[in-house]
């Protein structure tokens, strides 16, 4: 996160860290807890690393430096990448992770509400992006979970800023004209959440941007409302019933 500040304990209890353990262990992506056994993240996090057993998912944490060999983590039972995601495109950058064991909810570890299907009418004015990603383009992973308040921009405006890419209706963009605040490398898969009528909702999944926090280059997020049918279908068909936070 560029231009952000430290988060507090329990402030974003749905935020998880997706880490890979090969020879060393490192944070690669963020994700959002949406049910006892489900995490929503970006499909591109798994490019080149599709093996379930190399991943460790840490929930209910604030500081990555607090993680030791004794820190509990979740393992992956199943990775469900959107069937239309292609490595040659930037579309459908969404994936579900089914955890091997359900998580208990606590003050520091609980799910985020999902939006209603095809939610286009709600005007979100209080949106935040969180993650442990770089604090500048050529930076490094941060220890303390960062947060930043960023306004949504219209898809029309976003398309003007990204003429060489196709900004679809299944994407949502956020950023300041002058730049300075944005997600960055390592924040991928994490949440863009907006507070509406006193309730936090998962509006976007951190996907991509041209650099980080550059002027007139907003961040681009997968629009969760556009994938509600897919999320419900995959979580229900796998569980028999949807064990996740119901759409708001």
């Amino acid at each position: 996160i560029v231009g952000g500040t430290n988060s507090s304990w329990g402030e974003w209890p749905w935020q998880v860290s997706l880490q890979v353990k090969l020879t060393a262990q490192r944070h690669l992506c963020g994700g959002s807890l949406i049910g006892h056994q489900w995490v929503l993240t970006a499909a591109h996090c798994f490019d080149g690393l599709p093996l379930q057993d190399v991943w460790r998912i840490y929930s209910g944490i604030l500081n990555l430096s607090d993680i030791t060999k004794d820190t509990p983590f979740s393992q992956i039972k199943e990775i469900i990448i959107h069937q239309n995601y292609k490595v040659s495109e930037g579309n459908h950058d969404i994936a579900l992770i089914k955890l091997q064991a359900p998580l208990n909810y606590t003050e520091f570890q609980k799910p985020i509400c999902l939006p209603s299907k095809g939610d286009t009418s709600t005007i979100y004015t209080n949106c935040w992006v969180t993650g442990w990603g770089f604090s500048k383009e050529k930076g490094e992973i941060q220890n303390i979970l960062q947060k930043v308040n960023i306004p949504l921009v219209t898809n029309e405006e976003c398309q003007k800023r990204y003429q060489d890419y196709k900004i679809t209706q299944r994407m949502v963009c956020a950023g300041y004209k002058e730049g300075g605040k944005d997600a960055c490398k390592g924040d991928s898969g994490g949440p863009l959440v907006c507070k509406h009528n006193g309730m936090w909702r998962l509006v976007g999944i951190t996907s991509w941007g041209e650099g980080c926090a550059r002027r007139e280059q907003p961040g681009v997020y997968t629009k969760v409302a556009e994938y509600m049918d897919w999320i419900l279908e995959k979580t229900q068909s796998s569980d028999g019933k949807a064990q996740m936070q119901s759409p708001a």
């Epitope: 970006a42 591109h44 490019d47 292609k86 490595v87 040659s88 495109e89 930037g90 579309n91 950058d93 990603g133 398309q159 003429q163 060489d164 890419y165 196709k166 679809t168 997600a183 960055c184 490398k185 390592g186 924040d187 991928s188 951190t206 996907s207 991509w208 941007g209 041209e210 650099g211 980080c212």
Partner: antibody, heavy 125, light 108 residues
């Protein structure tokens, strides 16, 4: 299956014009950046031009700027290259190609992932 | 413009040998925009590696790419008969997009 089929090449005199077409199929054409790359006989690859998915943004190599125009018709899944004021040094096989733009670590990637078989343009008197 | 310099110009190797091809750029190139292509006579180029190190769909794992900044490498761990041809590196980090002059891999 992705297919790119160029047409319109041939022999033309210096100063003449030619219009190349590229019919695309097997993918959502309107979502992709498209490009033309050429290769003079026995030489290496040279990028010519690209066009944004909507067609609203075009970039050219200095060697063709002001003479060549790239365009597209997304309703017909077709890419074009209008070549005017042709010179002997424009003699080459012209490839129509698709630009893949994936995502890696919150950035986009870019590479030319699908190529047509090429059409030969010969500029000679 | 970003100049791409490939070396060697020609590489003469036997099947089963390891091939190491170099690509140097005149300016910093974002790795996400560095690709390698293979071309055999009379054929269109074929994408091998994108993002400096990711194999394109269907490309065997004997092909690998590494590098950062201005120095990139394509390695073919064990040459197969179908690997002979000309290899090009290319950057699309900045316009104009540029290709290297190519490295020809020939049978020894």
């Amino acid at each position: 299956e992705v297919q790119l089929l160029e047409s319109g090449g041939g022999l033309v005199q210096p100063g003449g014009s030619l219009r190349l077409s590229c019919a695309a199929s097997g993918f959502t054409f309107s979502h992709y950046l498209m490009t033309w790359v050429r290769q003079a006989p026995g030489k290496g690859l040279e990028w010519v031009s690209y066009i944004s998915p909507s067609g609203g943004h075009t970039i050219y190599a200095d060697s063709v700027k002001g003479r060549f125009t790239i365009s597209r018709d997304n309703s017909k899944n077709t890419l074009y290259l209008q070549m005017n004021s042709l010179r002997a040094e424009d003699t080459a096989v012209y490839y129509c190609a698709r630009v893949a733009q994936g995502i890696a670590a919150r950035s986009r990637t870019s590479s030319v992932d699908q190529w047509g078989q090429g059409t030969l343009v010969t500029v000679s008197s | 413009d970003i100049q791409m310099t490939q070396s060697p110009g020609t590489l003469s190797l036997s099947p089963g040998e390891r091939a190491t091809l170099s690509c140097r750029t005149s300016q910093f190139v974002n790795s996400n925009y560095l690709a390698w292509y293979q071309q055999t006579p009379g054929q269109a180029p074929r994408l091998l590696i994108y993002g400096a190190s990711s194999r394109a769909t269907g490309i065997p794992d004997r092909f690998s790419g590494t590098g950062y900044g201005t120095d990139f490498t394509l390695t073919i761990s064990r040459l197969e008969p179908e690997d002979y041809g000309t290899y090009y590196c290319q950057q699309s980090s900045r316009t104009p997009w540029t290709f290297g002059q190519g490295t020809r891999v020939e049978i020894k």
